[in-house]
Structure formats: C-alpha cells, structure tokens
C-alpha cells in the first residue's frame, strides 16, 4: 500500500487521525519539506531578538538582534552589544582601540595596523583607531623628485595618528 503521506507538500502534515489526509500546518507552525507527519513550531523572536523574517507555513521565522546589537552563533543564537568603529567590546564594555590597532566595524576586536616595512613598502596614509594604514611604494620605487601624499616615514611605522 502506497504511503499517502509522501504526497503531502510543504506547508502541510500527514494527519493520521484523518486517514492520512494532508492538513495545513496550524498557526505558528511550519513544514519546510513534504511528507511530514507533524509541523514544527515556529521560532519566537522575543526579548533581545527581533523578527527578520516572519514564519510561514513552509519556512521558520528568522531572528535578528534588536538595534544596537549584532548576532553571534548559528541562526542568530546570541546578541552582543555593538561598539563604535575604533572600539572593541571587552568585559568592561566598549573600549577604544589601543595605539597601533584599529577596528573598522561595530563588532570584533581591534587589530594591529599593517606593518608596511615587512613588504618593503612605506606608509602612505597613517593609521587611526578606525582605519588601517595605507601602504605605498617602497622608497626605492620612488624616482628622484617624485612626491607622495605623505612622505615615507619608516621610523614612525606602523603608522601614527594623534590620539
């Protein structure tokens, strides 16, 4: 005897109580594949979570974090406070990046400025708390009399900005 349940499309479930009739998923539940014997309950985006995508009969809700926070982990399973660019989140809250480091995002850690001299280059644009240094051509690559936006300053690498 053919299993009638295999004919039930996504968004329905195979109702054993009704001779294997395909019944629509009840409110706040879904089935993302055909042939399901039950519908799964929808995820609730509450508390620190807000709804990014509403639950439908064929797909689960998707959560995001409330304003000022960002998702961590699979399926946005935790919310972490945003910081400003030029900061990182520590156990004591958002702290400015130390000299010689930068963070150009609202999340993550401060990273060291690029050391241009490791590639035989010079600093073209100085680093800040929010931005990495920009490396330019090496001093040897500059023809006599050539000028650059910022004179090479190997002694000040990796970059410098007034704090």
């Amino acid at each position: 005897l053919q299993d009638l349940c295999s004919n039930c499309p996504a968004g329905t479930f195979c109702d054993n109580n009704r001779s294997q009739i395909c019944s629509p998923c009840p409110p706040n539940s879904f089935s993302s594949a055909g042939g399901q014997r039950t519908c799964d309950i929808c995820r609730q985006c509450k508390g620190v979570f807000k709804t990014r995508k509403e639950c439908s009969s064929t797909s689960n809700a998707e959560c995001d974090c409330i304003s000022g926070y960002h998702c961590l982990g699979a399926e946005c399973s935790m919310c972490e406070q945003d910081c400003k660019q030029g900061q990182e989140l520590t156990k004591k809250g958002c702290k400015d990046c130390c000299f010689g480091t930068f963070n150009d995002q609202k999340r993550g850690i401060c990273r060291p400025w690029t050391n241009c001299s490791l590639d035989g280059k010079s600093v073209l644009v100085n680093g800040t708390k929010e931005r990495d240094v920009v490396c330019g051509p090496s001093p040897a690559d500059l023809s006599p009399g050539a000028s650059s936006a910022t004179p090479p300053a190997p002694a000040r690498e990796p970059g410098h900005s007034p704090q």
Epitope: D40, G47, V48, L72, A74, M78, G93
Partner: antibody
Framework: QVQLQQWGAGLLKPSETLSLTCAVY????????WSWIRQPPGKGLEWIGE???????DSNPSLKGRVTFSVDTSKNQFSLKLNSVTAADTAVYYC?????????WGQGTLVTVSS | EIVMTQSPATLSVSPGERATLSCRAS??????LAWYQQKPGQAPRLLIY???TRATGIPARFSGSGSGTEFTLTISSLQSEDFAVYYC?????????FGGGTKVEIK
C-alpha cells in the same frame, strides 16, 4: 567586568510578598533584557520572567500573574515581586542577563517561606 | 511549553575520561539551545550557546552538538573542576525552559 549583585528578604511567611532587587555593574544596561530564575533546593532551574530598560516584560504562565517586574534605569537596577508566596516558592532566586542564553548571573538569594 | 529532558540523571566518570550528556526537546528547537555548568553553592555558568558555540573563556574540552530535538554536550577529558551539574536550556520559544540536569560525579 559585568557583575550582577542581588539582595532581598530571605525569610517570609505564607501569603507575604517576596521582593528582590538586582543591580548591574559594568557593561551596558539599556538594550539587554534582564531575567529572574529560581531553583528550589536540590532541584532544577525555572525561568520566572524578564524585563528590559523600558519596562517591557514577559513572565512564566506557571506563576499565574503573581509576579511583577520593575526597573530603575537611573540606578541600573531591576526588581522582582512575587505575591501570595507559599512553601512551594522556597528557592534560590537568581537574576541574570538575557542575551539569548543567560550569560551573566547574580550570586543567588535563598528565599525560605515558612510559617 | 517545550519540555527539555536530560539523561542520564547521574553520570559517574573517572578523571581524564570522556563524558557525554544528552538533552532532548519535546519539539524541534533548531539549534537554539544553551548548556550551563553549576557547582554547589554557585550560580550556573554559560558553557555553550547556539547548540555548539563555546561561550567566552570556556575550555576547548567542552563541545556541543545536535539540532532539532537531540543535543549532546561532550567533555573530552574530565578535569577535577568539571564535576558538577549540567543543564540544557531552550530559548527557541517562550516560556524559556531548562532540562532537569545531569550530575557528573567522580567514579
């Protein structure tokens, strides 16, 4: 370092109101949700409910409306009141920060209900 | 509400051995599950969130796996400080619910 410090009366008589307060030190207060969880002696954990800085709340239906939450953003504090307590409410009560899971917890307050 | 069931209730393991703890949800919760460790007289401590992501400062010997209704916490090589009670918790749906706990004791 985020720290949660809680206090409140530890011994109550039946029908009285349980009152606990939790202060948050370090980190951000606004934006997060703040929860209460309890643990009867030798048993598991039960979520009581939560509140955010603007006073939005949610609570466990099992407590049948006996619970009230409040928040004082000027002091970075939030509070729990549970009225008409019985011996079944005897537990260690914890406050915690809700970031999805509970990532920071208070030290716990043992509340005993006895006549 | 979603009911969380943990097994076994007690697990006797020798130091250095592997411990495997199970948690089952009464309905699918995707990967929206956390694990906590609680020692006597202390508050629980978050170990794992999102079923498999270690919280800040948690040693690599703790790992979580699973999705849907079946979840596992594995402690690869038990240290003396790991003997404690472990709880799973779902935050997929409200009310938030915990499992009954698994006590990991010294064999």
């Amino acid at each position: 370092q985020v720290q949660l410090q809680q206090w409140g009366a530890g011994l109550l008589k039946p029908s009285e109101t349980l009152s606990l307060t939790c202060a948050v030190y370090g980190g951000s207060f606004s934006g997060y949700y703040w929860s209460w969880i309890r643990q009867p002696p030798g048993k598991g954990l039960e979520w009581i409910g939560e509140i955010n800085h603007s006073g939005s709340t949610d609570s466990n239906p099992s407590l049948k409306g006996r619970v009230t939450f409040s928040v004082d953003t000027s002091k970075n504090q939030f509070s729990l009141k549970l009225n008409s307590v019985t011996a079944a409410d005897t537990a260690v009560y914890y406050c915690a920060r809700l970031t999805g899971p509970f990532d920071y917890w208070g030290q716990g307050t043992l509340v005993t209900v006895s006549s | 509400e979603i009911v969380m069931t943990q097994s076994p209730a007690t697990l006797s393991v020798s130091p250095g051995e592997r411990a495997t703890l199970s948690c089952r949800a009464s309905q699918s919760i995707s990967s929206i599950l956390a694990w906590y460790q609680q020692k006597p007289g202390q508050a629980p401590r978050l170990l794992i969130y999102g079923a498999s992501t270690r919280a800040t400062g948690i040693p690599a010997r703790f790992s979580g796996s699973g999705s849907g209704t079946e979840f596992t916490l594995t402690i690869s090589s038990l240290q003396s400080e790991d003997f404690a009670v472990y709880y799973c918790q779902q935050y997929y749906n409200w009310p938030l619910t915990f499992g009954g706990g698994t006590k990991v004791e010294i064999k």
